[in-house]
Interface confidence: low
């Protein structure tokens, strides 16, 4: 499929002008390459009529232009003074030859329609109301007034002043006079439908003294607005149907041959194919609304229509707005996972791409909710506090310049399953949808923190350890202190942790964090995690409570109390400068010794201990200032 897109059918009348917009993928080459408009001949050859290189054919001289708009990735062909000879098949395209990338356009130029003399032409859109004005002389002021529609030679009465109304115009047509006017009557026809189009005659009086006026009514199908969007990007349908339908239910539907299938409406209907990736938002109190669809797929391409009716369904004779959506498969938006799986108690790291040209834009993450028209409350953002219920377990890590940010959610529960959106307040195309599926855990988490009930005592030293499996051996381990504006990584001091290792002792990989001395403001959530460069992996969280030392209680070194028989000597030292003062997270060398003794005591049966382990006594040291 060609990535060039434009209007398939263009129609106009002799003497008028047309403006044809063609869309191309947003690439540097495309912006600068030759654009052309050519006419398709019977022999298959497409003869250039105008191009961006400055070529202009004889038959277009003085009446056509081709303008490139690289900032919009479009070019526009304007053709004036149309004649019926301009009817035919054309191509708009890109490339040095007319065989490159193109889109087929059919142009039809009709004759100017002929009407009886003094015919007033009314042009209205489907669903709207027309007011036909009928003038008469004073002699017919008290005579019967009527409006009829010409069908061949006959003229069938639509409405008259005796209160007759043709059944097909019932509840749609009214005849009235305004104020004290004695020489004009009006006929309103509302909820216009295509079959209402035609020639009407209004009449006051009978016989030769009757006053007659001709009115030609043209009822227009909505001209679809063309929307050119990249695969995986998002599209917004901005619908403005007017105040007269402000209080009616609104809908967006997708045309399917003769019908239009509702995708979403304000009465709660939603097509399952759009679950998790659609929002309907009222824009103001005048009936304006928008429908946003993210994560565009190939199959989303097609004709869409928005409308209003109390049923929330398409109805003939009600106003509509139309679009044709083209989904360009040559997308600039990277392919990211649309489904992320996690387990209860575990964590997920979701990478959200954004337009790299907009690194300063606000990034945010919201949870799509199905109620009513769909909504997406922000859970976390670069300038937004983490929402209630997510404290200590949700953080956004921006990676300026990388074109992506990462959202980490841990302490997962099955209630976290659902759809989430990655957004920025900049380029609205870069909105991605992720479905999070959380299953019940069947095994222990990969990262485990000890002690699990972490209470630190002010003024003392406190250490917590994070156990990780061998599969994370080569990855960077970190501790961070969670706060409402992110999880700030504590500076690490790791020596010997990346030495080559012949084998890995599954039970002996630890990264520890020490607070020394503990202060009141150390209380809060801490995360232990793994990452490789800018790619974040598994995390686990622990809440560290801080309390005053109770008088008279024996002084127990928390580092001894926290030691576990299963804890191991494979340590990476972390130095935490949580504050600017001397509260560095110094590693207590005694801790390693204690842990080693306990570990070895319970480990006699283990043969084949790796002699070259990264954390062996000789290769490990505490942090030093």
């Amino acid at each position: 499929q060609s990535p060039i897109f434009g209007p398939q059918d263009v129609s106009s009348i002799e003497g008028n002008s047309v403006s044809i917009t063609c869309y191309y993928p947003d690439t540097s080459v495309n912006r600068h390459t030759r654009k052309y408009w050519c006419r398709q001949g019977a022999n298959g050859y497409c003869a250039t009529l105008i191009s961006s290189n400055g070529y202009l054919s004889k038959e277009y001289s003085g009446r056509a232009s081709l303008i490139n708009f690289p900032e919009n990735s479009t070019f526009v062909i304007n053709i004036a003074h149309l004649t019926q000879e301009d009817t035919g098949s054309y191509k708009c395209g890109l490339g040095t030859t007319n065989r490159g990338l193109f889109f087929d356009v059919s142009l039809e130029v009709s004759q100017v329609p002929e009407f009886p003399n003094d015919t007033h032409v009314y042009t209205k859109d489907i669903g709207r109301t027309v007011t036909i004005e009928c003038r008469f002389k004073e002699g017919n002021a008290h005579s019967k007034k009527s409006l009829c529609k010409k069908r061949g030679e006959a003229c069938e009465v639509v409405i008259d002043s005796t209160e007759y109304v043709d059944p097909s115009y019932k509840d749609r047509a009214i005849l009235f006079m305004k104020g004290t006017s004695r020489d004009i009557f009006y006929v309103n026809i509302s909820h216009l439908i295509p079959s209402d189009a035609g020639l009407y005659v209004c009449q006051a009086g009978e016989g030769p003294s009757a006053d007659k006026n001709n009115a030609d009514l043209q009822v227009l199908e909505p001209e679809p607005e063309l929307l050119y969007k990249d695969l995986r990007s998002s599209v917004t349908f901005e619908c403005d149907l007017g105040r007269e339908v402000a209080n009616d239910a609104k809908y967006l539907c997708r045309k399917n041959k003769e019908t239009c299938d509702v995708i979403i409406n304000t009465l709660g209907k939603r097509d399952p194919a759009f679950e998790g990736r659609i929002l309907l938002t009222p824009r103001d109190d005048n009936g304006r609304f928008s429908v946003l669809i993210t994560g565009l797929r190939k199959e989303d391409a097609g004709h869409y229509q928005c409308g209003a009716h109390s049923s929330g369904l398409p109805q003939e004779g009600w106003p509509v707005q139309a679009w044709q959506l083209f989904v360009n498969e040559e997308s600039t938006i990277p392919n990211s996972r649309s489904v992320v799986k996690g387990v209860t108690g575990g964590s997920v790291a979701i990478v959200c791409p954004y337009n790299p040209k907009e690194s300063s834009s606000l990034k945010y993450w919201c949870h799509w909710e199905a109620d009513e028209n769909g909504r997406c409350p922000v859970l976390v953002g670069t300038q937004a506090l983490v929402q209630e219920g997510y404290e200590g377990r949700l953080a956004l890590f921006d990676q300026p310049g990388s074109g992506a940010y990462t959202v980490i959610l841990n302490q997962l529960t099955t209630q976290d399953s659902g759809f989430y959106w990655c957004l920025t307040d900049g380029d609205s195309r870069w909105r991605t949808t992720i479905e999070l599926q959380v299953a019940e855990a069947t095994k222990k988490p990969d990262l485990e923190v000890t002690p699990q009930n972490a209470t630190a005592v002010i003024g003392e030293t406190f250490t917590i350890s994070c156990h990780y499996p061998c599969k994370f051996y080569s990855q960077e381990k970190y501790w961070c202190k969670w706060s409402n504006d992110g999880c700030h990584i504590l500076p690490s001091h790791d020596e010997g942790a990346r030495q080559s290792s012949v084998s890995c002792d599954q039970s002996s990989q630890i990264v520890s964090m020490t607070l020394n001395p503990v202060k009141k403001e150390d209380e809060g959530w801490y995360w232990c995690g793994v990452k490789e460069g800018q790619v974040y992996g598994e995390t686990t969280a622990i809440y560290v409570a801080v309390e005053e030392r109770t008088r008279g209680s024996p002084h127990i070194n928390p580092t001894d109390a926290n030691a576990r028989a299963k804890d191991a000597p494979e340590e990476e030292a972390m130095e935490s400068s949580v504050r600017e003062d001397e509260n560095k997270a110094n590693l207590d060398p005694r801790l390693f010794a204690d842990e080693r003794e306990i570990q070895n005591a319970g480990d006699q049966a283990q043969e084949n201990r790796a002699s070259g382990n990264a954390g062996s006594a000789g290769g490990q040291s505490g942090s030093s200032k």
Partner: nanobody, 121 residues
């Protein structure tokens, strides 16, 4: 949800000056454009000036060179400095903002209640 509160209107003589301000509050996540519109009795509401998020400004021809729009993003506030006021500037001035809230990521139009500016000798 989102409130826009205008202030600074009043009665002023031709040639005088006024400074209007409009503060947005509520569960705001981001504001795209902020601007001023006005409506004189019996007339349509018309654009006066807009300050876009990117920093660009746009003025109605009738106020160019006399009115200056400015914006304080940190305070979610937009100002309109009106100099060399003329009787034709008499109208109700309305603040408008395109806001994405903490509940809905799409931008939506919000309007203030309006502040009256009367230029008369």
């Amino acid at each position: 949800e989102v409130q826009l509160v205008e202030s600074g209107g009043g009665l002023v003589q031709p040639g005088g000056r006024l400074r209007l301000s409009c503060a947005a509050s509520g569960s705001i996540f981001s504001i795209r454009d902020m601007g001023w519109y006005r409506q004189a009795p019996g007339k349509q509401r018309e654009l006066v000036a807009i300050f876009a998020r990117g920093g660009s400004t746009h003025y109605a021809d009738s106020v160019k060179g006399r009115f200056t729009i400015s914006r304080d993003n940190a305070k979610n506030t937009v100002y309109l400095q009106m100099n060399s006021l003329e009787p034709e500037d008499t109208a109700a001035y309305y603040c408008n903002a395109e806001v994405a809230t903490m509940i809905q990521p799409g931008f939506r139009d919000y309007w203030g209640q309006g502040t009256q500016v009367t230029v008369s000798s």
